[in-house]
Amino acid sequence: VLEVYYTSLRCRCVQESSVFIPRRFIDRIQILPRGNGCPRKEIIVWKKNKSIVCVDPQAEWIQRMMEVLRKRSSSTLPVPVFKRKIP
């Protein structure tokens, strides 16, 4: 599930990783657009083992994965599976 969060927090990620995470280990991907006090776009991957990893948005693997998820959600549902949480 792709989630786009709009929160009132500042940046959530101190560091980022570009290391590939296989899809079978991912529970959900949280996208924090630039804004809401943070000067950067942030992508947070919640793993099935309950650990959380901040991923470099420029990492090719996460861009490819998000594109696949977007295409899949738009072809199976009338609206994309973006969950917007607005404070």
């Epitope: 500042r10 940046c11 101190v14 560091q15 980022e16 630039r34 804004g35 809401n36 006090g37 943070c38 000067p39 950067r40 776009k41 948005p57 420029q58």
Partner: antibody, heavy 119, light 107 residues
Framework: QVQLVESGGGLVQPGRSLRLSCVGS????????MSWVRHAPGKGLEWVSA????????YYADSVKGRFTISRDNSKNTLYLQMNSLGAEDTAVYYC????????????WGRGTLVTVSS | DTQMTQSPSTLSASIGDRVTITCRAS??????LAWYQQKPGKAPKLLIY???SLASGAPSRFSGSGSGTDFTLTISSLQPDDFATYYC?????????FGGGTKLEIK
């Protein structure tokens, strides 16, 4: 290619107001974060303000907060900076910038417009 | 606010020299740092972002390194076109802040 053209600078008396404009072309204006950065004579660069593509998020340097307002009209591909209660310390070349995708880094710059605050 | 301190403020060097400029942050900013070049009467140009990523169109003789609080911009072999003022900028948090600049002069 990306082009940013500022206008509206000039000589203004202390306490008065001025509005700067910046017209962008060669990119999808409404999707881009935009900023104003200034360069005072003999000093370094100073970030002034930033605005999201939709205009829904704005940020300001402490030195201009409450006096300056950043806004945009995406139908005109134009960025604005409304400057009120101007003082001598606001004298500078003001640059309009387009940020890189996803980060607050000025990847593209206009040529700048000079604002001189003097009586 | 995160304060950015550059050193030296002025640097004299010759064509072909290897030049290093330092930027220090008042608090840890991971690798959220950019470098710009500005010539008199001209707009700045982006050289480096994310501490070490070369910006599009920037010559490969420019490189950046560092993480946390200490960062460097290196010019591997100084060219005539490189004499200018260089600024670092942090984008770890708002407000965005620039260093005071380093003026690179001909020796």
């Amino acid at each position: 290619q990306v082009q940013l053209v500022e206008s509206g600078g000039g000589l203004v008396q202390p306490g008065r107001s001025l509005r700067l404009s910046c017209v962008g072309s060669g990119f999808t204006f409404g999707n881009s974060w935009m900023s104003w950065v200034r360069h005072a004579p003999g000093k370094g660069l100073e970030w002034v303000s930033a605005i999201s593509g939709s205009g829904g998020s704005t940020y300001y340097a402490d030195s201009v907060k409450g006096r300056f307002t950043i806004s945009r009209d995406n139908s005109k591909n134009t960025l604005y900076l409304q400057m009120n209660s101007l003082g001598a310390e606001d004298t500078a070349v003001y640059y309009c910038t387009r940020d890189l995708p996803g980060i607050a880094v000025a990847g593209y710059w206009g040529r700048g417009t000079l604002v001189t605050v003097s009586s | 606010d995160t304060q950015m301190t550059q050193s030296p403020s002025t640097l004299s060097a010759s064509i072909g020299d290897r030049v290093t400029i330092t930027c220090r942050a008042s608090e840890g900013i991971y690798h959220w740092l950019a470098w710009y070049q500005q010539k008199p009467g001209k707009a700045p140009k982006l050289l480096i972002y994310k501490a070490s990523s070369l910006a599009s169109g920037a010559p490969s003789r420019f490189s950046g390194s560092g993480s946390g609080t200490d960062f460097t911009l290196t010019i591997s072999s100084l060219q005539p076109d490189d004499f200018a003022t260089y600024y670092c900028q942090q984008y770890s948090n708002y407000p965005l802040t620039f260093g005071g600049g380093t003026k690179l002069e001909i020796k």
